[in-house]
Interface confidence: low
């Protein structure tokens, strides 16, 4: 299953499959997730070790048992791969690291005014993997405002150094934010030239293309089909790069297929998994297990559930079957691809779905890094769970926010439906940033069912929570994925990094905003909050947030939207924007429905609706 917990001051001993330098534990975890053999990782922050060579060391590990002995190491952080974690799986990493220089091959230098502009340049350069930016206070004047675009053989820094007034980060191409655009074409009977960065065996060109997309240095590929003239090169997928970023030449060649990485696609990337099943094909590799199952789909599910399994072959040979069940060979290899591919067999083969974003409905997101008064503009994919609840009567308008918590579920405030309980008038927009981008052609979800908390009463602040079941499930993308729910009765976690998002008013007497706003707001104790609202009862099922001096808050139109807090690299839905005295007033914090107090209700309603739990809090 999906394990998201991090172990502080702990280091996994043994099991090493790879090592690299990463700026933090979350990036290390992401590299582990995408490494075909990595199940566990250990990370050594700069503060945890004197040995300069091992600072920022990220150690990727494998284990036959799925675990390794932990040894105490002050400052070290260890954890699990996010394979099998569904929508948490993402190669997108937005963080900017201050006071850190990520070293690599510097291939481009330019002057820019901000680190954000530098990151944008990196994202818009086909070869840039990461960057460093010297701020205006850098000690050498001639280097100030320099933006260095970089790459390395493995896609991670060749070294990471602590350096004042330098800021570093990664390209946002894996966030589907590149302005470059991509070539979707597949070229039959054409071979590309240039440098091979890797070779793998794949059953078709589409798997080859996906592997190229997620390989740090692959820009284009050539695939040799199963009828290629040289037998030993059949099904070979050659991952390629070039200085210019495009093939310097191409040659007409029977039984070859070529194409490009899709990493530079805007707004949509292929999933990092291969779901197709290949009949009449055997995949060879190291045997992990053999089990009798009924049907190839069950074989694929079995492989997906066994975290070390990378691919499988389901045999239909008479000697491999008994009654209705046949042998399911669960296999793995060093690079995650079959070491052999044989055609014309009585088997069917395919891959584990452990890296599919859709994954299991029952896991929660960790991966993404409010109008809102005193807020700032959000960027694409920053809050992918945020939805806009709009009402279409004669005209259409935004009324409330909401949070995507499952493929078919949105959590919002009950008071959003005061006077408008009719499900037909509502339209739910997900995966959007600008309300002005919504046209009559923009896809939206319709409501199948509105479930208002049974104890909610109109014009009262208690139990201000509602669930929306969508008519059709949503697919997850970088811009549209769920937020993780907290543990039931979560009272022990001290949240210090909380944000409210929404399109609501920017002042008490204002208007709905076009760009999704965000604001960082500290939580306030219920005792402190009660002092500020003496005419109201602040219950344990509410949570308050705000600055003593005011100035930043949620406002009209933000209702129902999320109050999210980041803890141990994971975002959780702590509150639902509910009510407050005006907006951003001094000593008048915003009041939010405390989601942890309603976990039983949420799980009961989402389960009873279709007999299956649709989301789950982290363990």
């Amino acid at each position: 299953g999906c394990l998201t917990q991090l172990y502080e001051n702990a280091f996994f001993r043994g099991g090493d499959v790879a090592s690299m330098y990463t700026p933090n534990a979350q990036y290390c975890q992401m590299r582990c997730t995408f490494h075909p053999r990595c199940l566990l990782f250990s990370f050594l922050p700069a503060s945890s070790i004197n040995d300069m060579e091992k600072r920022f060391g990220c150690f990727l590990k494998d284990s036959v048992t799925g675990t390794l002995p932990k040894v105490h190491r002050t400052g070290a952080v260890s954890g699990h791969s996010l394979k099998q974690c569904g929508h948490q799986i993402s190669a997108c990493h937005r963080d900017i690291y201050k006071g850190v220089d990520m070293r690599g091959v510097n291939f481009n230098v330019s002057k820019v005014s901000s680190v954000e502009e530098c990151q944008k340049r990196c994202t818009s350069n086909i070869r840039c993997q990461f960057f460093s930016y010297a701020t205006q206070t850098f000690h050498k004047a001639e280097y100030r405002n320099n933006c260095l675009l970089k790459y390395s053989p493995g896609g991670t820094p060749t070294a990471i150094k602590v350096l004042s007034n330098v800021e570093s980060g990664f390209s946002l191409k894996p966030c589907a934010l590149s302005e470059i655009g991509c070539h979707m074409n597949i070229f039959q009977h054409l071979a590309f030239s240039d440098v091979d960065v890797a070779r793998v065996l794949t059953p078709d060109a589409f798997v080859c293309r996906t592997i190229c997309t997620y390989h740090p240095n692959c820009l284009f590929f050539t695939f040799y089909t199963n009828v290629w003239k040289i037998e030993s090169q059949r099904n070979v997928c050659l991952l390629k790069t070039s200085e210019s970023g495009t093939p310097s030449s191409s040659t007409p060649q029977e039984n070859t297929i070529s194409g490009y990485s899709l990493l530079t696609c805007k707004r949509t990337l292929p999933e990092p998994c291969h779901s197709k099943i290949y009949p009449g094909v055997d995949f060879g590799g190291e045997e992990l297990n053999v089990t009798f199952v009924k049907g190839v789909n069950v074989c694929q599910e079995t492989c997906t559930k066994m975290i070390r399994c990378q691919f499988f072959t389901y045999s239909l040979l008479p000697e491999d079957c008994k009654e209705e069940k046949c042998k399911c060979f669960l296999r793995l290899s060093m690079d995650g691809s079959p070491t052999r591919i044989a055609y014309g067999t009585q088997g069917s083969s395919g891959y584990s779905l452990r890296l599919c974003n859709t994954g299991d409905n029952s896991v929660c997101t960790t991966k993404t890094s409010t109008r809102i008064v005193g807020g700032t503009n959000s960027s694409w994919g920053e809050w992918p769970w945020q939805v806009s609840l709009q009402v279409k009567l004669t005209a259409q308008r935004h009324l409330c926010g909401g949070s995507l918590i499952g493929h078919q579920w949105v959590l919002t405030a009950a008071h959003c439906f005061d006077g408008l309980p009719l499900q037909d008038v509502w339209r739910i927009y997900s995966g959007i940033l600008n309300l002005s981008d919504i046209t009559k052609d923009t896809p939206f979800s319709q409501i199948k069912e509105i479930i208002i908390h049974q104890n909610y009463k109109v014009s009262e602040g208690n139990h201000d929570i509602a669930l929306i079941k969508l008519q059709a499930p949503l697919n997850y993308t970088e811009f549209q994925k769920p937020i993780c729910l907290p543990s039931k009765g979560d009272t022990s976690t001290i949240y210090t990094n909380c944000w409210v998002t929404g399109w609501g008013f920017s002042k008490e007497k204002g208007e709905i905003q076009n760009i999704l706003q965000k604001v960082n707001i500290p939580l306030v104790t219920n005792e402190e909050c009660q002092k500020r609202y003496q005419d109201y009862k602040i219950t344990q099922r509410m949570v308050c947030a705000g600055y003593k001096e005011g100035g930043k808050d949620a406002c009209k139109g933000d209702s129902g939207g999320p109050l999210v807090c980041k803890h141990n690299g994971m975002w959780r839905l702590v509150g639902i924007t509910s009510w407050g005295e005006g907006c951003a007033r001094r000593e008048q914090p915003g009041v939010y429905t405390k989601v942890a107090e309603y976990m039983d209700w949420i799980l009961e309603k989402t389960q009873s609706s279709d007999g299956k739990a649709q989301m789950q809090s982290p363990a």
Partner: antibody, heavy 120, light 107 residues
Framework: EVQLLESGGGLVQPGGSLRLSCAAS????????MHWVRQAPGKGLEWVSS????????LYADSVKGRFTISRDNSKNTLYLQMNSLRAEDTAMYYC?????????????WGQGTLVTVSS | DIQMTQSPSSLSASIGDRVTISCRAS??????LNWYQQHAGKAPKLLIR???SLETGVPPRFSGSGSGTDFTLTISSLQSDDFATYYC?????????FGQGTKLEIK
Amino acid sequence: EVQLLESGGGLVQPGGSLRLSCAASGFTFSQYAMHWVRQAPGKGLEWVSSIYPSGGFTLYADSVKGRFTISRDNSKNTLYLQMNSLRAEDTAMYYCARGGWLAGGELLNWGQGTLVTVSS
Amino acid sequence: DIQMTQSPSSLSASIGDRVTISCRASRGIGTYLNWYQQHAGKAPKLLIRAASSLETGVPPRFSGSGSGTDFTLTISSLQSDDFATYYCQESFTNVYNFGQGTKLEIK
């Protein structure tokens, strides 16, 4: 010309240890999977162990799992086989072999072998 | 594991004869089959890979065929240097199973 030269064989008592080495030349060692194959006197060939190019991925025959360890030093173009808890049935000529392209399972080149005798 | 079975286990023939050696896999392995020749006291040598691809330097009198489970090594006209033991080996799995060998002797 590809050359593989095994060394380290000899007479050892049951329960003892030996470390075999295979010095490689004539090809880019770091790009190929390497294998150990053995042949008991008068018997057929038996695959023993394999190691992939980076050294991070190893495979063993069930008969030696937990007792033998394959490793490589790409900087020295050398393949190793550490053999512990040796048994009489491990007596054999041990060959090192270079795997095919793409870590292929065909054994392209073989050394002349080194003889391991386990006897009291 | 896949079992590889060679037949016959030994074979007597004369120079100039046409000889075929069979190898059967216990389950389908596509064309992932290799043939090796081993002279007494020497290291094995790869003759044929991928069921039918002749290695560079191997005389054309050697040929291989088959796919799936049944494979054949054929020597069209025996020469004195061909008297040796021949092994098939599957390379579909990562266990690299060998057949038990076929000893080709002079009649």
